[in-house]
């Protein structure tokens, strides 16, 4: 079958990195600079992806494979194949229409990307707040108040938690 196909279509003999040049009697010509063909039998070469602006080259384009981009420091990839770069924010912030903004009280973000999420509501699980939440960290839930009643198994008392917004003396 392969031999038959070759007789019918001379282009099928053109390997990756070349294209079947109709202007030159269907001979296999190398892909021009800044282009590639990743499979054999191609009638054209594809233009290489260019990593520009906030995109930087992770892998150079070759005659047989496209360039790959990632993002410059301060940005992270979004989308398939890093089709977008999104600005990092600091922990305790989220990216809004007006740039990076601090998380509102009662929310936190412990990463440089993503949105601020509400603190865990310990009382929903019948627990108490062991450590207060901050813009960067979720609250830590402790044992339920019932577990701390006299006669319950001894629990080492936690260090007093600082109120959010209060700096140490």
């Amino acid at each position: 079958f392969e031999r038959t196909r070759s007789l019918q279509d001379p282009c099928s003999n053109c390997p990756a990195g070349t294209f079947c040049d109709n202007n030159r009697n269907q001979i296999c010509s190398p892909c021009p600079p800044n282009s590639f063909s990743s499979a054999g039998g191609q009638r054209t070469c594809d233009i290489c992806r260019q990593c520009k602006g906030v995109f930087r080259t992770r892998k150079e384009c070759s005659s047989t494979s496209n360039a790959e981009c990632d993002c410059t420091p301060g940005f992270h990839c979004l989308g398939a194949g890093c089709s977008m770069c999104e600005q990092d924010c600091k922990q305790g912030q989220e990216l809004t229409k007006k740039g990076c903004k601090d998380c509102c009280f009662g929310t936190f973000n412990d990463q440089k990307r993503g949105i601020c999420r509400p603190w865990t509501n310990c009382s929903l699980d019948g627990k108490s707040v062991l450590v207060n939440g901050t813009k960067e960290r979720d609250v830590v839930c402790g044992p339920s108040p019932a577990d701390l009643s006299p006669g319950a198994s001894s629990v080492t008392p936690p260090a007093p938690a600082r109120e959010p917004g209060h700096s140490p003396q």
């Epitope: 940005f75 979004l78 977008m84 999104e86 740039g99």
Partner: nanobody, 122 residues
């Protein structure tokens, strides 16, 4: 061929002003959202300001009240008026076509200029 060419950079004293221009060609400028971004020496890129085709504008907090982004669709030009300049504004400033319409987010198909250097120093 798409081209974005920035001009107007230079050396200016703290408190001074500069007006950057960006001449666009090769795409439909009037219907494109545009942005200015900058890269300080040894630092990463920072989005500075954006303007929609409608004229609506957005600014990063650090330049709000000091910088003004504007456009002239008849001249296919984008501008950045920079007043009350500070040493920390020193950077290469880039003009870019901004496809995502999401502040701080850039798309691989966005167009970028080569940049113009702004140095704020006494």
């Amino acid at each position: 061929e798409v081209q974005l060419v920035e001009s107007g950079g230079g050396l200016v004293q703290p408190g001074g002003s500069l007006r950057l221009s960006c001449a666009a060609s090769g795409f439909t400028f009037s219907s494109s959202a545009m942005s200015w971004a900058r890269q300080a020496p040894g630092k990463g890129f920072e989005w500075v300001a954006s303007i929609y085709s409608s004229g609506k504008t957005y600014y990063v907090e650090s330049v709000k009240g000091r910088f003004t982004i504007s456009r002239d669709n008849a001249k296919n030009s984008l501008y950045l008026q920079m007043n009350s300049l500070r040493a920390e504004d020193t950077a290469v400033y880039y003009c870019a076509r901004w496809k995502t319409l999401r502040v701080g987010v850039w798309d691989e198909s966005d167009y970028w200029g080569q940049g113009t250097l702004v140095t704020v120093s006494s």
